[in-house]
Amino acid sequence: MMTGTIETTGNISAEKGGSIILQCHLSSTTAQVTQVNWEQQDQLLAICNADLGWHISPSFKDRVAPGPGLGLTLQSLTVNDTGEYFCIYHTYPDGTYTGRIFLEVLESSVAEHGARFQIP
């Protein structure tokens, strides 16, 4: 039975040209995290494998940085980065947990940043 829950930063906004940290946290389960995928719609941004570490998709290599923790930092944001982002936790023995974050990239310099979630 899957008992875990994913906490995310929820809906966040950031300024064009700036950067943002996408964070998810899996709690309420003792399942072992084997891999975390970060995806934007159907595009793979990055993967953190428990054994082998981070792989950043070549198309995002210059704009994505791993961390902090299992989170992901998006840099040099453009309006086209607006949309849904998913953290997909692959765990054993539970299976897969998915969290959703909506990012809005604003042209304005008064972008309201959502609270940045930190892994304890």
Partner: antibody
Framework: EVQLVESGGGLVQPGGSLRLSCAAS????????MDWVRQAPGKGLEWVGR??????????EYAASVKGRFTISRDDSKNSLYLQMNSLKTEDTAVYYC???????????????????WGQGTTVTVSS | EIVLTQSPGTLSLSPGERATLSCRAS???????LAWYQQKPGQAPRLLIY???SRATGIPDRFSGSGSGTDFTLTISRLEPEDFAVYYC?????????FGGGTKVEIK
């Protein structure tokens, strides 16, 4: 041409130290994981350890048989990989290979890891 | 750590024959992290197969790989004189990376 060339092997006494080098050319060194693999005379292949790439902060990991005695490092500005071997034992006698580790994910989200480029090897003999 | 057991230890065959090499893991491994290498005397290993079944660049199609879970197979459909060598399987996840003990394919 993608190439790896090891050097630094030789004869050393038990308890001694040796530093192996691996010069890489023909590819973007900083993007790749790099592994050391050894082969004792007449035996099979044994993984020694690896250093991850820049994205992974050059994290290093080692086989249990060498942990605490061997240290892997790299200098991306020189496209070079190193293996510092201390407290050498007779059972460390082997040909040492450096190899390029390919770590990536396909469009199917399947992960891959394999060693696609190997050096010619350098011989380390530990004997009194 | 995962132990990879290769069998047979030695395979004696004639050119033109089919070679079937086995690699068995002590526990389940992801097929995408399973590779096969060929090594000839005095030479470095050469990558043949990765992801259990994908041929590396420049590898002839007489080499094929298959399997999943704990059982993997390397098949050489028709042995050529240059195929007589030692073959190793390797897995990378879970850590640490391990190799099988090798199978020597020799001329009968």
């Amino acid at each position: 041409e993608v190439q790896l060339v090891e050097s630094g092997g030789g004869l050393v006494q038990p308890g001694g130290s040796l530093r192996l080098s691996c010069a890489a050319s023909g590819f973007t060194f900083t993007d790749y994981y790099m592994d050391w693999v050894r082969q004792a005379p007449g035996k099979g292949l044994e993984w020694v350890g690896r250093t991850r790439n820049k994205v992974n902060s050059y994290y290093t990991e080692y086989a249990a048989s060498v942990k605490g005695r061997f240290t892997i490092s790299r200098d991306d500005s020189k496209n070079s990989l190193y293996l510092q071997m201390n407290s050498l034992k007779t059972e460390d006698t082997a040909v040492y290979y450096c190899a390029r580790g390919q770590y990536y994910y396909g469009s199917d989200r399947r992960g891959y890891y394999y060693m696609d480029v190997w050096g010619q090897g350098t011989t380390v003999t530990v004997s009194s | 750590e995962i132990v990879l057991t290769q069998s047979p230890g030695t395979l004696s065959l004639s050119p033109g024959e089919r070679a079937t090499l086995s690699c068995r893991a002590s526990q389940s491994v992801s097929s995408s992290y399973l590779a096969w290498y060929q090594q000839k005397p005095g030479q470095a290993p050469r990558l043949l197969i990765y992801g259990a079944s994908s041929r590396a660049t420049g590898i002839p199609d007489r080499f094929s790989g298959s399997g999943s879970g704990t059982d993997f197979t390397l098949t050489i459909s028709r042995l050529e004189p240059e195929d007589f060598a030692v073959y190793y399987c390797q897995q990378a996840v879970p850590s640490p990376l391990t190799f099988g003990g090798g199978t020597k394919v020799e001329i009968k």
